[in-house]
Amino acid sequence: SQVSQNCHNGSYEISVLMMGNSAFAEPLKNLEDAVNEGLEIVRGRLQNAGLNVTVNATFMYSDGLIHNSGDCRSSTCEGLDLLRKISNAQRMGCVLIGPSCTYSTFQMYLDTELSYPMISAGSFGLSCDYKETLTRLMSPARKLMYFLVNFWKTNDLPFKTYSWSTSYVYKNGTETEDCFWYLNALEASVSYFSHELGFKVVLRQDKEFQDILMDHNRKSNVIIMCGGPEFLYKLKGDRAVAEDIVIILVDLFNDQYFEDNVTAPDYMKNVLVLTLSPGNSLLNSSFSRNLSPTKRDFALAYLNGILLFGHMLKIFLENGENITTPKFAHAFRNLTFEGYDGPVTLDDWGDVDSTMVLLYTSVDTKKYKVLLTYDTHVNKTYPVDMSPTFTWKNSKLPNDITGRGPQ
């Protein structure tokens, strides 16, 4: 049903869905702090631009009785229940921030006439791609796929002289929400990644993964998995690994690799870690003080969602345009705005662009070093270390198919 938006006459409200089921197990209080910090900045910017308006957030909590798994599995209905709550209260803001679960975002987008923008910290899955009024502020699966295809095809770097066309993907079903959808995208037979590879097999059992490490008949030397170093260790332990195996560990929302005192454990020597370029300061704001690196990215996405709304509100008000229009709802894309931690770029479909970083373990220093970076905005790879001290023979990445190239 049509719900009137509290979004005019100098008063602009943001509806923040505080869902029990979330992409990251983050205390809702921390998300509230992030939102409130964002509101302070937005109010300052609007006031200084001579726009005497009120901007507030309404936090919409679900009852938590029905939807209490805490993860995203039961989120589909929770999102719709919250929308129903908004509808019953006849109180919808100019913009909806949340949900973070792919299931709930997809269902809410499907089941509502969205004449307002929706900003998500999450919604990683391919099913949330190309949604006209949805903006995603954490790297979605599509961005990961494009990097992997780009990297697989690269063959003109000193450390990578072979194009790859094969891969194993390890996916055992216990992954975190981001990893679940990243691997889901790689597994999907209709996805860009599957389309571009000649061979791809999903390993679902620990034993399958462990066997491949020394299997002379393996069909690929490359294994993609998602998680942190500890996750890899639990699976791999100290098992011997064939010297031409390359494990790609996707661990986007983890700054720990860049900390000064971090030493790479020995089991990481065959591993390339894909992560995001870190924020380069230890933020001392109220919302980030007690956060782990992963959770900081999640809370930061909420804060940046507020700043994005403020950015768009300022533009529309300065141009004398109406906020409760389809034009406003469709405007949250193809732009760069000043986020809390620096510039945030959104692509044509409202998905955040970022710099991905591929790290390797230096055999000399036992430190993580940057091998290359990848700008998702221009789909371009930039080599950083032209003479990496790899574990692989001749300091070059092996061919992806055993029996060809350096072994």
Partner: antibody
Framework: QVQLVESGGGLVKPGGSLRLSCAAS????????MNWVRQAPGKGLEWVSV???????HYADSVKGRFTISRHNSKNTLYLQMNSLRAEDTAVYYC????????????WGQGTTVTVSS | QSGLTQPPSTSGSPGQSVTISCTGT?????????VSWYQQHPGKAPKLLIY???KRPSGVPDRFSGSKSGNTASLTVSGLQDEDEADYYC??????????FGGGTKLTVL
Amino acid sequence: QVQLVESGGGLVKPGGSLRLSCAASGFTFSSYSMNWVRQAPGKGLEWVSVIYSGGSTHYADSVKGRFTISRHNSKNTLYLQMNSLRAEDTAVYYCARGAGTLNAFDIWGQGTTVTVSS
Amino acid sequence: QSGLTQPPSTSGSPGQSVTISCTGTSSDVGAYSYVSWYQQHPGKAPKLLIYAVTKRPSGVPDRFSGSKSGNTASLTVSGLQDEDEADYYCSSFAGGSTLVFGGGTKLTVL
């Protein structure tokens, strides 16, 4: 009214240090990114550094590792600590407010002159 | 990050139009719609004229306009006036948190 006032410039020997300050007034300082931009005598503008509202900092390659930008929100003041100064750092240093739209600096100070010479 | 390329100087008579170009690459001007233009009179601080390629801050006369095509941005000053004689700088967001300036163009009003 909205204003930025730089101070702390002067003559310093190569290898020496200097700390520039920029006092802001007339706006909510903490809501904005703040930048340092410099201009060598008779030359063009060169972006030096930025600090965002969240405290994240970035630098031009030419000053990375030698200069440190910081802010004190309750004092409405921006700083630039310059160490290991070189002759090529000689310039007028401007502090500039980010307009909330990237690389648009809508408010500039009058500049403070730094001369590095033996 | 190398700078953007501007012509060192240009000139025009009062009432005429002049256009100053600013050429970058597909990683800066071509990749983002964030080109700014600044005017600087001798001994003064720069002043923002244009931001986000085409937008004018309040108080800037509509004689100043910006545009972009591919890797090149342009500033057009129409109805040239004596007080327009100054140095003009372009700048572009270049990804990450970097931005680059052009070398500057001296505009002389004949």
